[in-house]
């Protein structure tokens, strides 16, 4: 190459399809056969073109026709007279991809092709997107400014056309498009949250455009608060509403996880509250939803659980009534007798003594959820409840001997049943049969019987003398026997008996005594008379 001719241009130029680029270029040529007034012509050619016959892609030579495919798109913006060969390529197309070289003509001598020192134009797919600058969270009713920037700007290149679309732009105000950015002002509404706002950048060639979509985040108070429940690590379900407050039944010992989630912007602080006691809370940036774990629910975990979601724009809360179900526990009988208000707790197998004729109230008590069905049985027979509204209460206004025996309270429950039994023993004072006497060969034989509960004791009196055991003189003999509530005693009197003596049989227990007398001893023909006294 002639050392007096040189050109400086980048070796490779890359431009996205449809865009415009400016290629800086400078060159030098000898001052030979031209003056300052001699016109300087510059030409850019595709490397496939013959410079003498072919059309350049750009030139400042008005009478020279340019390549049809580049007409109006390629422009020699530099002044060849000043050694400037800068070229602008607008609306770059795939077919423009090629090697290009520059030719200068000035006067008769300077007619030179810079054949080996051109540039290669590579046209790439348009993948660049505009950048949209928008506050992270928008306040409803507060005007906001959004900027869209497309970072591709060259001198001599026309600015692209910007446009905006989005549901929030029913009444937008846009500032005029400037070189490579657009400013949009609008006032977001609550309903604009989660809607799209798109900045479109359109270039001269039809169909060549770039766009960027952002999702609007408009601040709003918590809404759509949802409580869901996961039990024993099963997937979460929403509780069933019962009235205004959802109701949840859980079995004692179950694993429960209560989950609370709310839609809000900015994210809300979530908290779980049980009867005004905060059980757990989350930071706005913490994990969502907020979980409350009850590893093995207890009866004491029952109650109203409230989830509260709160941010600077407001709050929302929802409650959940938890009922922990469990089978009967601590089943026992409380007893009130003889109108005493003092209640005693009796456990299973207790024996309960009651005085005949007294009143007795048995109250069966247990804890369970839901309440167990209570009933009383005696010797396998179901007893009618004294108070149908409270089948756990059994009232016996006058206890009779026939009431004696086992009473059982049954607590029936879907999760398991229990029963408690107590043994009722009816106490009464002695009832006396006798005494009766008869003569026998050995002497006078008398017998006396008594029934009582507890079993009575019997003793004999002859006049004022108490006859106990056997006399030392063998003058009498007492033979006791007993079976259950009966006590029997036989008295044998030997030897002479003075007439007019009074023989008495006495029966006694803790509840009282009864005695019967024979006022006149019988002759050997039988009994004369008998009198009873208590």
């Amino acid at each position: 190459m002639d050392g007096r001719f040189w050109i400086r241009v980048q070796e490779s130029v890359m431009v996205p399809e449809g865009l415009c680029i400016s290629v800086p270029c400078s060159f030098s040529y000898p001052r030979q056969d031209w003056t300052g007034s001699t016109p300087a012509y510059g030409y850019w050619f595709k490397a496939v073109t013959e410079t003498t016959k072919g059309a350049p892609v750009a030139t400042n030579h008005q009478s020279r026709e340019v390549e049809m495919s580049t007409r109006g798109r390629f422009q020699l913006t530099g002044d060849p007279a000043k050694g400037n060969c800068s070229l602008v390529i607008r609306d770059a197309q795939m077919q423009d991809e090629s090697q290009y070289f520059f030719r200068v003509e000035r006067g008769s001598y300077v007619r030179y092709n810079f054949m080996n020192d051109g540039f290669f134009l590579k046209v790439t797919a348009l993948t660049q997107k505009p950048d949209v600058y928008i506050p992270e969270t928008l306040e409803p009713g507060q005007p906001v400014t959004v900027i869209c920037v497309f970072n591709w700007a060259f001198e001599e290149c026309p600015p692209p056309s910007f446009s905006w679309t989005g549901a929030a732009l029913s009444s937008q105000g846009t500032k005029p498009t400037t070189s490579h950015f657009s400013v949009l002002s609008f006032t977001p509404r609550p309903q604009d949250h989660n809607t799209d706002l798109t900045c479109h950048v359109d270039f001269s060639r039809k169909g060549v455009s770039a766009q960027r979509t952002v999702r609007l985040r408009v601040a709003y108070a918590p809404r759509d608060l949802v409580i869901s429940i996961s039990r024993d690590n099963t997937p979460a379900l929403e509780p069933q509403p019962q009235g205004n407050v959802p109701y949840l039944e859980a079995q004692k010992g179950q694993f429960l996880r209560l989950l609370c989630a709310a839609d809000s912007q900015p994210p809300a602080t979530l908290s779980w509250v049980l009867q005004n006691r905060v059980l757990s809370s989350s930071h706005p940036w913490g994990p969502r939803p907020l979980g409350l774990e009850l590893p093995g629910v207890k009866a004491g975990d029952s109650g109203r659980y409230t989830c509260r979601a709160e941010n600077r724009l407001g709050s929302q809360q929802r409650a959940l009534d938890l009922s922990v179900q469990y089978p009967p526990e601590n089943l026992r009988v409380m007893v009130s007798q003889a109108n005493r208000t003092v209640l005693e707790n009796l456990g299973n197998g207790t024996s309960l003594p009651v005085l005949e004729g007294q009143s007795l109230c048995l109250v069966c008590v247990t804890h369970s959820s839901p309440p167990a069905r209570l009933s009383w049985t005696q010797r396998g027979q179901v007893l009618s409840p004294s108070q149908p509204s409270d089948p756990g209460v059994l009232e016996l206004p006058r206890v009779q001997v026939e009431h004696e025996g086992e009473f059982t309270c049954h607590a029936r429950h879907p999760l398991g049943s229990q029963h408690v039994s107590l043994s009722l023993s009816v106490h009464y004072s002695p009832k006396l049969l006798g005494p009766s006497c008869s003569w026998e060969a050995e002497g006078l034989h008398c017998s006396c019987s008594s029934q009582a509960s507890p079993a009575p004791s019997l003793r004999w009196w002859l006049g004022e003398e108490l006859l106990e055991g056997n006399s030392s003189q063998d003058s009498f003999e007492v033979t006791p026997s007993s079976a259950g509530p009966w006590a029997n005693s036989s008295l044998s009197l030997h030897g002479g008996l003075s007439s007019g003596l009074r023989l008495r049989c006495e029966a006694w227990n803790v509840h009282g005594a009864q005695s019967g007398s024979i006022l006149q001893l019988p002759d050997k023909k039988g009994l004369i008379s008998t009198a009873f006294s208590n």
């Epitope: 490397a47 496939v48 795939m94 077919q95 090629s98 090697q99 590579k122």
Partner: antibody
Framework: QVTLKESGPALVKPTQTLTLTCTFS??????????LSWIRQPPGKALEWLAH???????RYNPSLKSRLTISKDTSKNQVVLTMTNMDPVDTATYYC????????????WGQGTTVTVSS | DIVMTQSPATLSVSPGERATLSCKAS??????VAWYQQKPGQAPRLLIY???NRYTGVPARFSGSGSGTEFTLTISSLQSEDFAVYFC?????????FGGGTKVEIK
């Protein structure tokens, strides 16, 4: 003088991967603006452009085959390699290595072509 | 993809006669069209680029015209060596696509 020569297996089985090599001379693929393409032609049918590689290792693929194609170059060996996975009998064709005139998207230099048959 | 449709599929012409081959693009491709000639057992050969520019060494009897969507290759006076298959190609947008070809045979 610019020459291009394709080489590779004449027969491949379905599902196999085809590897074709284009060995060139008369120019350097490190020169700005230089690039090579692969084009194929099934028997008695039209030509189909497959892929292109530039001097700067930038690549272009036909979208309909992009997932199956890989083009690469070894400038020191003056070679360009095309691999095509999951071959099928419909891929039976003559495969050409071509060069664009001054980097243009029309092709002045063609290799002789290599015929590939896909059959089990 | 841009579809290039060539017609007719076969053209029967006598030597010395004029042959006109048509190529239609499914969308505007400007002048980004090239024409190739292919003889049996050979690789294609570039004839025309940019719709109307004849490639170096191509005889003057071959000429191209058209822009937008309709393009024509004309062989003014057919020589015996011109009987072959001719393909058009667009390079306006990716992917590059070729026509199905027109076979020019001796009448």
């Amino acid at each position: 003088q610019v020459t291009l020569k394709e080489s590779g297996p004449a027969l491949v089985k379905p599902t196999q991967t085809l590897t074709l090599t284009c060995t060139f001379s008369g120019f350097s693929l490190s020169t700005s603006g230089m690039g090579l393409s692969w084009i194929r032609q099934p028997p008695g049918k039209a030509l189909e452009w497959l892929a292109h590689i530039y001097w700067d290792d930038d690549k272009r693929y036909n979208p309909s085959l992009k997932s199956r194609l890989t083009i690469s170059k070894d400038t020191s060996k003056n070679q360009v390699v095309l691999t095509m996975t999951n071959m099928d009998p419909v891929d039976t064709a003559t495969y050409y290595c071509v060069r664009g005139l001054y980097g243009n998207w029309f092709f002045d230099v063609w290799g002789q072509g290599t015929t590939v048959t896909v059959s089990s | 993809d841009i579809v290039m449709t060539q017609s007719p599929a076969t053209l029967s012409v006598s030597p010395g006669e004029r042959a006109t081959l048509s190529c239609k693009a499914s969308q505007n491709v400007g002048t980004a069209v090239a024409w190739y000639q292919q003889k049996p057992g050979q690789a294609p050969r570039l004839l025309i680029y940019s719709a109307s520019n004849r490639y170096t060494g191509v005889p003057a009897r071959f000429s191209g015209s058209g822009s937008g969507t309709e393009f024509t290759l004309t062989i003014s006076s057919l020589q015996s060596e011109d009987f072959a298959v001719y393909f058009c190609q667009q390079y306006s947008s990716y992917p590059l696509t070729f026509g199905g070809g027109t076979k020019v045979e001796i009448k």
